[in-house]
């Protein structure tokens, strides 16, 4: 070894999405999820791994409940920190229905679309966050089968904070969830005790989401 | 912007009847519960019951059941509290107030993030 | 239902000065499930903090809570003229809300 050789620390860096990916994430904004800044919390952690642009990874964000709100398209912010900068200030929407299936139908039928900024030949993502049971489940089924024949990957996140504050059981609820996942589903499904424990999925959920370019 | 709006003071005599109102607005206000709290003259706060606009579900404190009537009107965005016969001590300010949060099946829980800026009723 | 208890009930202080305020529950709080709020005279409660330590929106960074279980504080770094006020603790996590019976914070 040279005796000029040094050894010099390196940190490497927080790993990015620097691939082509449109991902919609899909919101359950009802009132059970509670506290809602842990979402933007959860949003925020996420999208900050992104290298997000035009050219890169496009991220929109869809909120349901009882109807839906597109709270932003694909093609709406250009770097990572506008986006981080909008998803600080969505509000949540409210209501009592989790129309889980609407949700979902609408981002594959609208966000998807390039009117809304879709790309050409670059992978569809989904993520959706939901903390209880469908009030539409009848539609589930077909509304995943369309977003399988569209090639959307799905990751779902169970949140099961209301179901242990009311003591219930969440079988029903996790089942419903998985059946929303792409297979294979112990890499697309995900469950948190509650809404405070979702940054803890963050890196995982990322690194997955990452891979699918990989 | 956020905001709640109640109705005006009142001056009633023991017996007679009252309906005080709470307009929301700057939100969609179907789709939040709105609570209703008691402050009595130099005396804390005391919640009385809450209700859900989009469908009337409500919820009373112990302490207030079939003391008070709690209601809502969704089409015109209010919620009200009413007495059927008023007594000296429901002398105290009333605030309504949103709940951030939920109160569907046997659990509520949340916090009143924006309130009412409060009507005086007094009954003498 | 859950008790909370507040001390102590009045404390006197200078603006610059720290405030510590208590809310003790007769027994647990589920899930951390409590608020603090500022009323001043003649005025609505103001929501200051909730899940015992996250700050409201708009709320200066001098207000801080913590605590779990059964003890919470709400802490004032450095009293402002305008943080007079009475502070009130509440929990919600027992399918009910109930309220402290508040602490003033007046001008020494």
């Known amino acids: 070894v040279s005796p000029t050789f040094q050894v010099v620390n390196s940190i490497a860096p927080v790993q990015e999405c620097s691939t082509q990916l449109d991902i919609v994430i899909v919101l359950d904004g009802s009132n059970s999820i509670y506290p809602w800044d842990s979402v933007t919390a959860f949003l925020n952690d996420l999208l900050e791994r992104m290298d997000i642009g035009p050219k890169q990874t496009q991220v929109g964000i869809v909120q349901y409940g009882e109807n839906v709100t597109h709270e932003f398209n694909l093609n709406k912010y250009s770097s990572t920190e506008e986006v981080l900068v909008a998803a600080k200030k969505i509000v949540q929407r409210g209501g009592r229905q989790t129309m889980t299936a609407l949700g979902i139908d609408t981002a594959r039928k609208e966000a998807f679309t390039e009117a809304r900024g879709a790309r050409r030949g670059v992978k569809k993502v989904m993520v959706i966050v939901t903390d209880g049971e469908s009030h539409d489940n009848h539609r589930l089924k077909k509304v995943i089968q369309d977003c399988e024949d569209e090639n959307i990957q799905r990751f779902s996140i169970a949140i099961l904070g209301s179901y242990n504050r009311g003591n219930l059981s969440t079988e029903k609820f996790v089942e419903e969830i998985k059946s929303i996942a792409s297979e294979p589903t112990e890499k697309h499904f995900f469950n948190v005790s509650d809404e405070l424990a979702l940054v803890t999925i963050v890196k995982t959920l990322g690194e997955r989401i990452f891979a699918l370019e990989a | 912007e956020v905001q709640l709006v109640q109705s005006g003071a009142e001056v009633k005599k023991p017996g007679e009847s009252l309906r005080i109102s709470c307009k929301g607005s700057?939100?969609?206000?179907?789709?939040?519960?709105i609570g209703w709290v008691r402050q009595m003259p130099g005396k804390g706060l005391e919640w009385m019951g809450i209700?859900?606009?989009?469908?009337?579900?409500?919820r009373y404190s112990p302490s207030f059941q079939g003391q008070v009537t709690i209601s809502a009107d969704k089409s015109i965005s209010t919620a009200y509290l009413q007495w059927s016969s008023l007594k000296a001590s429901d002398t105290a300010m009333y605030y309504c107030?949103?709940?951030?949060?939920?109160?569907?099946?046997?659990?509520?829980?949340?916090?009143?993030?924006?309130w009412g800026q409060g009507t005086l009723v007094t009954v003498s | 239902e859950i008790v909370l208890t507040q001390s102590p009930g009045t404390l006197s202080l200078s603006p610059g000065e720290r405030a510590t305020l208590s809310c003790r529950a007769s027994?647990?709080?589920?899930?951390?499930?409590l608020a603090w709020y500022q009323q001043k005279p003649a005025q609505a409660p103001r929501l200051l903090i909730y899940?015992?330590?996250r700050r409201a929106t708009g709320i200066p960074d001098r207000f801080s809570g913590s605590g779990s279980g059964t003890d919470f504080t709400l802490t004032i770094s450095r009293l402002e003229p305008e943080d007079f006020a009475v502070y009130y603790c509440?929990?919600?996590?027992?399918?009910?809300?109930?309220f402290g019976q508040g602490t003033t914070v007046e001008i020494k």
């Open positions: 107030a949103r709940l951030q949060g939920d109160c569907s099946g046997g659990t509520c829980y949340g916090h009143f993030d924006y």
């Open positions: 700057g939100y969609s206000v179907t789709s939040y519960w």
């Open positions: 209700i859900y606009p989009g469908d009337s579900d409500t």
């Open positions: 027994q647990s709080v589920s899930s951390s499930y």
């Open positions: 899940v015992a330590s």
């Open positions: 509440q929990q919600y996590g027992t399918s009910s809300w109930t």
